[in-house]
């Protein structure tokens, strides 16, 4: 029986060009975490395996950093990073727990100001 719950940072926003930490926490279970996958829609961003450590998908290596903990840090954010992110906890004996985070990447206030009052 799966008794655990995933707590996440929920809906978050960050400025374009900045960075954000995606965090999930598994609680209310004594199940052993064997691996955590981080995914964006259907793309694998990173894996933290209990034996092997962190693996960052090659296409994200320059913008994704492992941690803190089992979390994930996204850097040099673009508006294309807006969307759903999933932490997938593989545990024993419970099975798989999934948490969802929605990230909205906003144009920075400076960029917005510049765009609005541009001299023709």
């Amino acid at each position: 029986m799966m008794t655990g719950t995933i707590e996440t940072t929920g809906n978050i926003s960050a400025e374009k060009g900045g960075s954000i930490i995606l965090q999930c926490h598994l609680s209310s279970t004594t199940a052993q975490v064997t691996q955590v996958n981080w995914e964006q829609q259907d793309q694998l961003l990173a894996i933290c395996n209990a034996d092997l450590g962190w693996h960052i998908s090659p296409s994200f290596k320059d913008r994704v950093a492992p941690g803190p903990g089992l979390g994930l840090t996204l850097q040099s954010l673009t508006v294309n990073d807006t969307g759903e992110y999933f932490c997938i906890y593989h545990t024993y004996p419970d099975g798989t727990y999934t948490g969802r985070i929605f990230l909205e990447v906003l144009e920075s206030s400076v960029a917005e100001h510049g765009a609005r009052f541009q001299i023709p």
């Epitope: 052993q32 090659p58 593989h90 545990t91």
Partner: antibody, heavy 124, light 108 residues
Framework: EVQLLESGGGLVQPGGSLRLSCAAS????????MSWVRQAPGKGLEWVSA????????WYADSVKGRFTISRDNSKNTLYLQMNSLRAEDTAVYYC?????????????????WGQGTLVTVSS | EIVMTQSPATLSVSPGERATLSCRAS??????LAWYQQKPGQAPRLLIY???TRATGIPARFSGSGSGTEFTLTISSLQSEDFAVYYC??????????FGGGTKVEIK
Amino acid sequence: EVQLLESGGGLVQPGGSLRLSCAASGFTFGPYGMSWVRQAPGKGLEWVSAISGSGASTWYADSVKGRFTISRDNSKNTLYLQMNSLRAEDTAVYYCAKDPGTHYSGYYYIWRYWGQGTLVTVSS
Amino acid sequence: EIVMTQSPATLSVSPGERATLSCRASQSVSSNLAWYQQKPGQAPRLLIYSASTRATGIPARFSGSGSGTEFTLTISSLQSEDFAVYYCQQYVPHPPFTFGGGTKVEIK
């Protein structure tokens, strides 16, 4: 600390049988895939067999298919390799190794943790 | 069966120098490639997996690259403890999982 301890090796005549054991400790044995990998004296590494965490799925190298049987007893945290119809070319150090993956995450078939190995010598 | 070929068979390098080891697969293995180090009388030690990801605790002087059929393990500055035999291994999702013949890195 993950520990894998093989036993059961020794000298056996061609055509004979031997059963290797690998006692696992320091981790929850049940979910993890396990493998046997061998190394003939002075030679390279050869994957022999693998088994899923539940024991329901097994895989073998062609060189041992039909002669070797991999199994596990999760209640005893032990992996086995039953070797029948042994040949001179089966002479090797046999290592048991822990897969980093489980049924849920998928198996990797690479190995961070290995035992110290047990020597099997097939000779008349 | 996918055949893994390593070259050279023996590499003579002085401590502090760079060592470059090659591994070729007979057909594409994507990035499903691992590198191991083995010293006499010891079990292999996993260094690299997914072609370029260092396993936990492996020093940064070890790096892997490549995909498809051509792979490289680089040791940027050889330490005395790095003289050993190195094996590549492919782990495409279906068995058998095959190793290369090994490259012995010896002191020049």
